[in-house]
């Protein structure tokens, strides 16, 4: 049953375009619901909260709304997300979401910036099945610079233990990496003087790992069709999905360049499962 | 271009009964709860039911439960009224819409309306 | 259910001149959730009605920013600073916080 593929090249086409806007519904010429994601710049020093905004033109009653950090490998890595009137934190606690009163307007915070939390960050909203719809915002950069010493006046300054505790580290970094570039030196002289030893060396993967073509080739994720992105990019292993009705239809998304984790197959039904009491179940009133 | 189109509506004796349709575009259907709201001509707005997304959880005001049902179909993006044992104060135009649903902040969209005429 | 009451029932006001319309609910609109679900609609002639405002103050896009809504638990106001003769119609009042959704009666606002 994994192994079915659905015809669903739209998806995989879109998705192959690099997650440029995409939706799937009546009229494929201008995208429903177009996404802000405003500053488009944004400075802060380290430590201070960044934060963006994320805009729905117009609000549906049910949809999913993610916090995307562009990889420098042009993937989303999903942050946060907001589902049915519920937050949900991504792994890293420090990345939040929070909507707004008018329900239109999402804050993306990121708490007490790092300097490798730099980079283009982006919101994406996914109206859902059975015409399942994605839309992206513009991309948005953040610059987190490193904190300026201050003048006694202002605040305090940090203690000057703590410039020599980040010299440390460096140092630290550099010698672990001129470590390991030396190892894999050696290991290549190793292999360059007794070929022999390696020749008959032979590699064999598992029957559940996927099957690569070349060197380039792309690994391939079936999804059903309407879990697009719902989970987080994490290779850890997943328990088995409950088996998804027959009429499930899939959707093979490949995505380029990516590493390939097993279990990443999710069913609709999963989508339902990952969702608290969706408003659809409960009485005539819930949460705004 | 976001558009409600509803039809169905027909002059129809006491007691008979109707479908309405409301066919959406332009937008995401099945990401709305819908509503059905009508109006007795030059006389003010009265909720009818609505139906949320899935499609299983339905509500309807005291003066037509049990006679009407409403429904949708995703996959058409249509929504659905079938009204039973009609009678003469069930005379309206009837209006599909959007945003019109308890503690919902979702856009409001409203079609032109379709009109139903009891009398025998 | 909840009985939504507007008034006045017509008003007749200049061009550039401000408009207020009243509406109260026989009980609170305020929600657990602690926002009060209170929309208002504008019906033009002839035409369907049209969402203004949503929880009381947050206006729909497209919505000029001459009108603008307020209150709290069962007493809410819209009000438009500067009418004109395009903000002819009936306006309502409608209640969000409790199934069944009610409306009030409706307000005619007409341009002098």
């Known amino acids: 049953m994994g192994s079915r593929r659905g015809p669903w090249p739209l998806v995989w086409a879109v998705l192959q375009l690099g997650w440029w806007p995409g939706w799937l519904l009546d009229s494929p010429d201008r995208p429903w619901s177009p996404l802000t994601f405003s500053p488009a710049q944004l400075t802060v020093q380290e430590g201070e909260n960044a934060t963006f905004t994320c805009s729905l033109a117009d609000i549906p009653d049910s949809f999913v709304l993610n916090w995307y950090r562009l990889s420098p490998r042009n993937q989303t890595d999903k942050l946060a997300a907001f589902q049915e009137d519920r937050i949900e934190p991504g792994r890293d606690r420090r990345f939040r979401v929070t909507r707004l009163p008018n329900g239109r307007d999402f804050h993306m915070s990121i708490v007490a910036a790092r300097l490798n939390d730099s980079g283009i960050y982006l919101c994406g909203a996914i109206y859902l099945p059975p015409n399942t719809q994605i839309n992206e915002s513009p991309r948005a950069e953040l610059s987190v610079t490193e904190r300026t010493l201050e003048p006694p006046t202002q605040s305090p300054s940090p203690p000057p233990r703590l410039s020599g505790q980040l010299q440390g580290l460096v140092i630290g970094v550099t010698s672990v990496l001129v470590g390991v570039l030396l190892l894999l030196l050696l290991t290549w002289v190793l292999a360059a003087v007794f070929p022999r030893a390696t020749r008959g060396a032979c590699v064999c993967g598992s029957e559940d790992e996927p099957l690569k073509e070349g060197p380039d080739a792309a690994p391939v994720f079936t999804l059903d069709y309407g879990e697009l992105d719902f989970q987080w990019r994490e290779k850890t292993p997943e328990p088995p999905a409950p088996c998804a009705p027959e009429q499930t239809e899939y959707a093979t998304i490949v995505f380029p360049g990516r590493p390939a984790s097993p279990g990443r197959r999710a069913s609709a039904s999963s989508l339902q499962g990952a969702q608290p009491p969706s408003p659809e179940d409960g009485p005539g009133l819930w949460p705004p | 271009q976001v558009q409600l189109v509803e039809s169905g509506g027909d002059l129809v004796k006491p007691g008979g009964s109707l479908r309405l349709s409301c066919v959406a575009s332009?937008?995401?259907?099945?990401?709305?709860?819908m509503t059905w709201v009508r109006q007795v001509p030059g006389m003010g707005l009265q909720w009818v039911a609505y139906?949320?997304?899935?499609?299983?959880?339905?509500s309807y005001a005291d003066a037509v439960k049990g006679r009407f049902t409403i429904s949708r179909d995703n996959a058409k993006n249509t929504l659905y009224l079938h009204m039973n044992s009609l009678r003469a104060e069930d005379t309206a135009l009837y209006y599909c819409?959007?945003?019109?649903?308890?503690?919902?902040?979702?856009?409001?969209?409203w079609g032109q309306g379709t009109l139903v005429t009891v009398s025998s | 259910d909840i009985v939504m009451t507007q008034t006045p029932l017509s008003l007749s006001v200049s061009p550039g001149e401000p408009a207020s319309i009243s509406c109260k609910a026989s009980?609170?609109?305020?929600?657990?959730?602690?926002?009060?679900?209170l929309y208002w609609f504008r019906q033009k002639p002839g035409q369907s009605p049209q969402r203004l405002v949503y929880?009381?103050?947050y206006r729909d896009p497209g919505v000029p920013d001459r009108f603008s809504g307020s209150g709290s638990g069962t007493d809410f106001t819209l009000r438009i600073s500067r009418v004109e003769a395009d903000d002819a119609g009936v306006y309502y009042c409608?209640?969000?916080?409790?199934?069944?959704?009610?409306f009030g009666q409706g307000t005619k606002l007409e341009i002098k």
């Open positions: 819409a959007t945003g019109v649903v308890p503690t919902t902040v979702a856009s409001s969209y």
């Open positions: 332009g937008f995401p259907f099945s990401s709305f709860h």
């Open positions: 139906v949320k997304t899935g499609g299983s959880s339905t």
């Open positions: 009980q609170s609109l305020l929600h657990s959730s602690g926002y009060t679900y």
């Open positions: 929880k009381v103050v």
């Open positions: 409608g209640q969000g916080i409790k199934d069944p959704f009610t």
